[in-house]
Interface confidence: medium
Amino acid sequence: AVNGTSQFTCFYNSRANISCVWSQDGALQDTSCQVHAWPDRRRWNQTCELLPVSQASWACNLILGAPDSQKLTTVDIVTLRVLCREGVRWRVMAIQDFKPFENLRLMAPISLQVVHVETHRCNISWEISQASHYFERHLEFEARTLSPGHTWEEAPLLTLKQKQEWICLETLTPDTQYEFQVRVKPLQGEFTTWSPWSQPLAFRTKPAALGKDT
């Protein structure tokens, strides 16, 4: 039937990984499916097995090489196909021409650490992981701080419109436990999206000195 809905979405991490999600209403529960990558100007092909992530969606990672190797460029086009086994043959369930640098989602920032903490402020740094050198400085970041009694969704977003791998959080409350997360996005790419949020970094501000407010 033609009236079901289906989606095939993939992102390139800018180095050596293409992550894909295939979702389909009323999908083939017990069928073996895979994603096949077929570049237009490279000698390699790559496949990964789609594994269920929910009732009607499957995901897999095409590992193209060593994590920091630059396997694709801005001129590459990779034909991506979802293939599902039907008896003895494979049937094409979805197909697209994938332009890696138009569909970017970087890895979450790593190595978050408190550089300096005071009663009302905290300086935090991080690193980006497996990001292409092609970006040079053309990256932006979003950060958020979890305050006591609030949820992550309530936390205001702080935007850093340049490649700045540190932040100074101000107007914090003394002697209070906080958590901090950051994510990254290249400026390039029509369908580019934010990386996942980093692992939260927990920190505590210093208590106020007795008799004075610092």
Epitope: A1, T5, S6, Q7, W38, I77, I95, Q96
Partner: nanobody, 123 residues
Framework: QVQLVESGGGLVQAGGSLRLSCAAS????????MGWFRQAPGKEREFVVA????????DWPDSVKGRFTISRDNAQNTVYLDMNSLKPEDTAVYYC????????????????WGEGTLVTVSS
């Protein structure tokens, strides 16, 4: 907004040939997967074939395998469906569709549809 206009349909004798064309407006034609679908009287619309901008195609339904061929001219913003050895059961309205990625069948990602062109195969 991409507009798709099919042409080339008509009445043909069984065993004959037709070439359907689908002309697309828009500057990013080569970015789209282009597909042909058909809908016979009283039946659901069914997938026939798709071709990517890099001219890679999906597999064919057994009913048309070896008889139909898809091609595209990115410079002319046109996709073609060459149909040979036509049979009465190929009678249908043939539709052109475009999408960034084309699920085959369900059509969740179809972005644009043409109005269709009627192919009638008489015995």
């Amino acid at each position: 907004q991409v507009q798709l206009v099919e042409s080339g349909g008509g009445l043909v004798q069984a065993g004959g040939s037709l070439r359907l064309s689908c002309a697309a407006s828009g500057r990013t034609f080569s970015s789209y997967v282009m597909g042909w679908f058909r809908q016979a009287p009283g039946k659901e619309r069914e997938f026939v074939v798709a071709i990517t901008g890099t001219r890679r195609t999906t597999d064919w339904p057994d009913s048309v395998k070896g008889r139909f061929t898809i091609s595209r001219d990115n410079a002319q913003n046109t996709v073609y469906l060459d149909m040979n050895s036509l049979k009465p059961e190929d009678t249908a309205v043939y539709y052109c569709a475009s999408a960034r990625g084309l699920p085959v069948p369900p059509l969740g990602d179809i972005i644009h549809w043409g109005e269709g062109t009627l192919v009638t195969v008489s015995s």
